[in-house]
């Protein structure tokens, strides 16, 4: 015989769940023991069966889970899974916060990405700081020339996707350019999107020829300027 224990504690590390109103929330407390334990759920210390909740709840005992769809502010609280058998019991608390802020288009920090000048062979980092209520997705684009033109017949620029990423809110997204050459020079765009819309800002990368060390030593006062 064995008291209940968590089988996947790493899946329970996210204690605070802050989700936008209307989203689905799933709490899991995967456990085992001998005899096989049962699971009960409490909300703010009281037995929770979801009977007073519009839309109810889904309890999937074989998955040790509680699912609530279309959460509303009244769903806020502490949710406790109580796992017990004849030998003992264990419990774990989840905190649910339902966010009511109006989700908006991603906001990009002014001045990022920044115009940058680099020397051939050097490494470059372009930064993009995104603020978004909904989880944003990011694309780094390079504006390219096709048949001698930067724009198509529709007036829109030709772009090439360099990198795509899904990031958490308020993270800094970085585009790394290693060992840059003259071909890397040009306009780069950080495009951020979420369920509400897209926002994007651009910067120029200027790539200078490799400095001749003898020329630099002989004429230290001569320097490239923007």
């Amino acid at each position: 015989q064995q008291a209940p224990y968590w089988t996947h504690p790493q899946r329970m590390e996210k204690k605070l769940h802050a989700v936008p109103a209307g989203n689905t929330v799933k709490f899991r407390c995967p456990a085992a023991g001998n005899p096989t334990p049962t699971i009960r759920w409490l909300k703010d210390g009281q037995a929770f069966h979801g009977e007073n909740r519009i839309g109810g709840i889904r309890l999937r005992h074989q998955h040790w889970s509680l699912v609530m769809e279309s959460v509303v502010p009244s769903d806020r609280g502490t949710y406790t899974c109580l796992v017990e058998n004849a030998v003992g019991s264990i419990r774990y608390n989840y905190l649910l916060d339902v966010l009511e802020r109006s989700p908006h288009r991603p906001i990009l920090q002014a001045g990022l990405p920044a115009n940058t000048t680099a020397v051939v062979g050097s490494d470059v980092e372009l930064l993009c700081k995104v603020y978004s209520d909904a989880q944003p997705h990011i694309q780094w684009l390079k504006h390219i020339v096709i048949n001698g033109s930067s724009f198509g017949a529709d007036g829109f620029p030709y772009v090439q996707v360099l990198k795509t990423a899904d990031i958490n809110s308020s993270e800094v997204e970085v585009l790394y350019l290693r060992n840059v050459s003259a071909e890397d020079a040009g306009e780069y765009t950080c495009l951020a999107g979420n369920s509400i819309g897209l926002s994007y800002q651009s910067a120029w990368l200027t790539v200078l020829p490799e400095e001749d060390p003898t020329w630099t030593a002989a004429a230290p006062e001569a320097r490239y300027t923007d």
Partner: antibody
Amino acid sequence: EVQLLESGGGVVQPGRSLRLSCAASGFTFSSYAMHWVRQAPGKGLEWVAVISYDGSNKYYADSVKGRFTISRDNSKNTLSLQMNSLRVEDTAIYYCVRGAGRGFPYGPDGFDIWGQGTMVTVSS
Amino acid sequence: DIVMTQTPLSLSVTPGQPASISCTSSRSLLHSDGKTYVYWYVQKSGQPPQLLIYELSNRFSGVPDRFSGSGSRTDFTLKISRVEAEDVGVYYCMQYIEAPLTFGGGTKVEIK
């Protein structure tokens, strides 16, 4: 041709449920957020809900929060709206609308393509 | 929520004459990326809305150049330089900067 086609409307009693569907074609459905907008008879337009391209984010108008659920099946190019606890004031034409895509916006980033709409009448 | 207020409620125009519709938002629609997220639609009888203008002043593909959008921050205008019979319908402005997305109450354009 880019198209959105709604279905599932009908007459239903207050308190009952209805499920609307929207079939998308002519574009990469899984790359776009999708919205529902409704219009009560003789009235203006009211935004109802949005779902992100992968279904991970959903937002609702206060008037339907807790009663309506937006969902999508990218494998079937289908958007759905599950409407529970229907009220007389939910009577409207429901439009499926394409939202923002994931790539560079060659034109508007959404709200450019609308379906023909499906009529929902809630009446006792 | 952002409130969109449209004027006038209705408009009766002689063909070939100009028409102007105003829309005011309760908050600025100028976003950090420099764009102003106001859209204009026309809804003809028995049809879904059709996009005319996006991001304040950009004409959607296929929209005649007699339609133009202008304004800044909270005050917006849709102009039809020479109204034609096919322009009858209800015109709506919409803010597309945050949820809930909101529409103006509509302006009904009729031909004299």
